[in-house]
Structure formats: C-alpha cells, structure tokens
Interface confidence: low
C-alpha cells in the first residue's frame, strides 16, 4: 500500500509503498504465543501524528494506524548526503482480540528499534527482499519496499539506493524473478553435540548437523523450497527422559522450535526416531507460522545400549512440505553408559560405500 505525508501546502515530503508482516510474541492464559499478521489493506496514515518535520528542529515521521489501536511509525533523520529511518516503533493493543486472541494482559505496548533503512538524499530506498526489524517481542518485515523522505517534487526519484539483501553477492548471479525453483543450496550445517539427562543420568547423546527443508507458498503465490541450517551457536537445547519417550527440544533463531522424539520398541529392545515437530516463522510465506509434525517415523534405529551412526546425509521426510536433512549423525537414546556412545551400528548407506 502507498502511504504519503504532505506538508501544509500539499507537497509530499514522505512517500512509502510497502507491504508489512508482523510477528508478535505475547502472553496468553496458556503460555506465550506467536501471532503473525499482515499490515491490512485498510491501514491509514495518521495525518495529525505524521509530520514533514520542521527545519532543524524536528524530523519527518510517518505514522500508520490499523486495527484497534495498532500504529507503525517510521521516524526519519538525515545528514548532508544520506537519510534513514532512524527509528521504527510499533504500538500494539493486546485487547484487540482479533489480532491477539486470549492475551492475558490487555495493555497497550510500545516497542522500537533502529533500522538499516537508509538511502542517498534525492534517491528512493528500494528493497524487494524482506527487510526485518527486530524489536522486543516483535519482528516487522517490510516486503517490496519503496520509501523516500525529504522529497523535492512530490514523487519518487528515478534513482534508487538498493538494500544490501537485493544486491548480488560477488559469487552469485543477479537476483532472478520469483519462481518455484529451490533457493540456493547453503553449505552443510555445522555438526554439534547434544545430550539430554534425567534423574537416572544421560538418556540421549547425539552428534549431528541439521538442515530444514521447507516447501511453502509465498505471498506472491509462487512456491519456494528453502534449506535452513540450524546454527548450533544460536541454538539452545533441552529435553526430557522418560521410560518410553526421550525428547530433544532445540530452540533456534527466528522463534524456531524443533522437537525430536525417540521411542523404544520394548520387545525388540531397539530405539528409533519416532517423531519430529517443527514450529517456525517464515516472514515471506502466505501463512508465516509454519508448523509440521509426524509422530510415526521409524528412522535412526539401533539396539538399546548401542549407537546409530551415519556419515552419509540422511533425509527424514516429516510431511509433504517438510523434511530434515541430518548430516554425520551419531545418536544413542535411552541407555547411555558412562555418558559415552556404545557399540556402533552403521547405516546401510555407509556400509554400501565401504
């Protein structure tokens, strides 16, 4: 949508054309929730709060209102050669039950953050890729953004400053138009060690690299497949030990929660990866809250007391839209003596390569 701020004589000083997606963490009666929603088409510029600023005393600001009391504000500043969105702030009203169902508090919250949105004076800022601004409990993602402040003639300049994300890196070709083809393949994920302990000692030892393979529909109706590596340095692991179920819970970037459940077949004394559950946010997706689960898997199997090892990349299909690529996996569940891996049971893929 296009948002315009004009001065007293009707000349535009700010023009902004973008779509925005909001991801808000808030507290409900049953625990924290993440709500994602788009800037609605009926969002309006708040004329009495927006301003072109006054020479040397105040800076221009664009205030956009929607829903029951939500406002998104872009505060601009400039120096001799460049201007920027110095501060983005978002005010949201937790009593808006449409956007924040079951919120346990009904107060109005304000969050704000500096941004990377900047351009040369007399050039428009252009960013086709998503521009994310992280604030406390809120992430705002601007898509297909054209923004310009300190306008001289009530229209966007022909020249533009492109955002970093839109610029081709030295090793890649210029960005292609959106298509159903997969994203560029990232490097193999880093291998990390995970362990889960309970009152009776360690019940899970795992060493592996994890890559999420997600297929989803974007807002522009194209289907995209993305490969996302789980970065061990930005992941916190926890879990639980049970007689019949061992869980490994990984909290990673972008409110990603990946849950592994290992089960045991008592009659054959074998453990196996029984379930995988994923909750994550994909800002460019038509439905940004991506969830997938399958609790009837039979992967990574070995005898209890032994460990399962596979150097070859393993693909575990969770749903039609989600699979996990597991690299250099070495895992042992339920019975782990002395915190060490037991006798190794190699995967078939490795045996065939020997």
């Amino acid at each position: 949508a296009m948002f315009i701020v004009k001065n007293g004589n009707g000349t535009a000083c700010i023009m902004a054309n973008f779509s925005a997606a909001f991801s808000v963490n808030y507290d409900t009666k049953s625990g924290p929730k993440n709500m994602t929603f788009d800037l609605p088409s009926d969002a309006k510029v708040v004329l009495n709060s927006s301003s072109c600023g006054k020479e040397n005393t105040s800076d221009p600001s664009l205030v956009i209102a929607f829903g029951r009391g939500q406002t998104l504000t872009l505060n601009f500043t400039r120096n001799a050669t460049r201007y920027s969105v110095q501060l983005m702030s978002f005010v949201y009203n937790l009593s808006d039950t449409h956007l924040f169902p079951n919120a346990s508090s009904k107060e109005i919250k304000t969050v704000e953050s500096i941004t990377d949105i900047r351009a040369d004076i007399d050039k428009k800022y252009r960013c086709v890729s998503g521009t994310q601004v992280h604030m406390n409990n809120v992430t705002v993602t601007l898509h297909d953004a054209t923004i310009q402040a300190y306008l001289s003639n009530s229209s966007f300049s022909r020249e533009e400053t492109r955002c970093e994300q839109d610029r081709p890196s030295p090793t890649t070709a210029p960005p292609a138009p959106p298509s159903p083809s997969p994203s560029p393949v990232p490097e193999s994920p880093s291998v990390d060690k995970y362990n889960v302990s309970g009152t009776n000692g360690t019940c899970l030892l795992a060493s592996m690299g994890l890559q999420l393979n997600l297929t989803y529909e974007r807002k522009d109706n194209t289907t995209v497949t993305r490969l996302l590596n789980i970065n061990p340095n930005k992941t916190l692991a926890s879990g639980s030990c049970g007689a019949h179920l061992v869980t490994l819970e990984l909290h990673s970037e972008g409110s990603t929660v990946l849950l592994f459940q290992f089960g045991m077949n008592a009659s054959s004394s074998r453990f196996f990866l029984q379930g995988i559950q994923l909750n994550t946010t994909l800002p460019d997706a038509r439905d940004p809250a991506f969830k997938a689960a399958n609790s009837s898997l039979r992967a990574l199997q070995a005898t209890v007391g032994n460990s399962y090892k596979c150097n070859a990349e393993e693909h575990v299909r969770v749903t039609k839209a989600f699979s996990v690529n597991i690299f250099k996996v070495w895992v042992q569940a339920f019975k782990v003596e002395g915190g060490q891996f037991g006798s190794v049971e190699e995967c078939l893929l490795d045996e065939n390569n020997m």
Epitope: D27, K29, S30, G31, P32, N136, L236, S238, H251
Partner: antibody
Framework: QVQLVQSGAELVKPGASVKMSCKAS????????IHWVRQAPGQGLEWIGA????????PYAQKFQGRATLTADTSSSTTYMELSSLTSEDTAVYYC???????????WGQGTLVTVSS | DIQMTQSPSSLSASVGGKVTITCKAS??????MAWYQQKPGKGPKLLIH???TLQPGVPSRFSGSGSGRDYSLTISSLEPEDIATYYC????????FGGGTKLEIK
C-alpha cells in the same frame, strides 16, 4: 534438561513478608511463563500468579492481588515471589512451575516450605 | 476468577474397576483443561492437557473428555498405583485448580 531449583525452607512471623526464588535452567528463560502454586498441609493446589520473563507481565489470582509480587531477573534466569502480610493460613509448600509450550504446568520445582508461626 | 467444582471429593473403587472424576467450570473454558495426579509427599504430575491429550508416558487407561463447562477424567481399569489425589485445572482465563479428588482402593 529443564530444571527449576527453588530456595530453602523459611520460618517467618505473622505480619512479615517472605521472598523466595526459583532458578531455571535447560531452556530459554524468556520464552516461557513461570507460575507459582501453593499447597497448604493436607489441602489442595492453589494458583497464585504467573510471570512472563520476556516482558515482565504478571497476572495474579484475585485472592493474591496486591499481596503477592512476582519478578524475574533475566540475567540469572531466576524468578522471585514475595508474599506480604503473612498469616498462619499462608503456611504451605510453594511451587514454581514452567508451562511447556501450550501444555499446562509440565515442569515443577521441588517446592519451598514456608511456615508462618510466632 | 473462574471457579472449578470438582466431584467427588473422595471415592473408593476396586482394582480393575472404572473410575470417573468430574469438574465443572463456572463458565465456558474452551477445552483448556488439564488433569494432575499427586501422590503423598510428591509434587503433582501432569496426566492430560487440552481436555484429552495424554502426556507421553501416561498409561492409556487414563482418558479425558468434555467441552464447554463440563469435563471428566476416566480411569478405565484401576491399578493399585493409581491411588492418589487428582486435580483438574482450567487455564483458559488465568488459572484455577479444582478442589481435588482423593482416590482409594476398596
């Protein structure tokens, strides 16, 4: 492994206040509510309140509004509960509890026994 | 605050028998109901959440049902280790426990 470790037993006089702690580990502290529940000897469970360390929001049961105060220190992943104007009826085991995703109370601390006696 | 009325407050049943405990909320709680088991000297243990979802490791003889204001916990075939006090909990609007049901073996 999610763990909630509570501070030790307290013996306090009527009219005084008590402040107990609950140190969390094994998960991202700011992502989950911590609830406080008490159980008087031979009695049932009573919900006191909760705090979401991510933003400090803290709803309370009507009965404890104004008398219980929940706070969270994110640097040490510790939640505190202070209860004021104590009477003998406040003698109880006080539990801190973490909600697990949308599941109700799934992880419990070991409890802190508070005895109010002159 | 929502009030929870749990009944009976105590009951005696035979091993192998079927047991049902009920909880009534003072208003619609939209299936945000959980059930706990507490054995003497121990902390409570979560059995069921979201009215009918069994926690991992909880025997299948336990089941939960209900909607609106009325909810129940059923033990289909009582085992000696099921002797405990059971509590319901609503978590739709703030949180409230029921008064508890003490279960004994006949």
């Amino acid at each position: 492994q999610v763990q909630l470790v509570q501070s030790g037993a307290e013996l306090v006089k009527p009219g005084a206040s008590v402040k107990m702690s609950c140190k969390a580990s094994g998960y991202i502290f700011t992502n989950y509510n911590i609830h406080w529940v008490r159980q008087a000897p031979g009695q049932g469970l009573e919900w006191i309140g909760a705090i979401y360390p991510g933003n400090g929001d803290a709803p309370y049961a009507q009965k404890f509004q104004g008398r219980a105060t929940l706070t969270a220190d994110t640097s040490s992943s510790t939640t505190y509960m202070e209860l004021s104007s104590l009477t003998s009826e406040d003698t109880a085991v006080y539990y801190c509890v973490r909600a697990n995703w949308d599941v109700a109370f799934a992880y419990w601390g070991q409890g802190t026994l508070v005895t109010v006696s002159s | 605050d929502i009030q929870m009325t749990q009944s009976p407050s105590s009951l005696s049943a035979s091993v192998g028998g079927k047991v049902t405990i009920t909880c009534k909320a003072s208003q619609d709680i939209d299936r945000y109901m959980a059930w706990y088991q507490q054995k003497p000297g121990k902390g409570p243990k979560l059995l069921i959440h979201d009215t009918s979802t069994l926690q991992p490791g909880v025997p299948s003889r336990f089941s939960g049902s209900g909607s609106g204001r009325d909810y129940s916990l059923t033990i289909s075939s009582l085992e000696p280790e099921d002797i405990a006090t059971y509590y319901c909990l609503q978590y739709d609007n703030l949180w409230t426990f029921g008064g508890g049901t003490k279960l004994e073996i006949k």
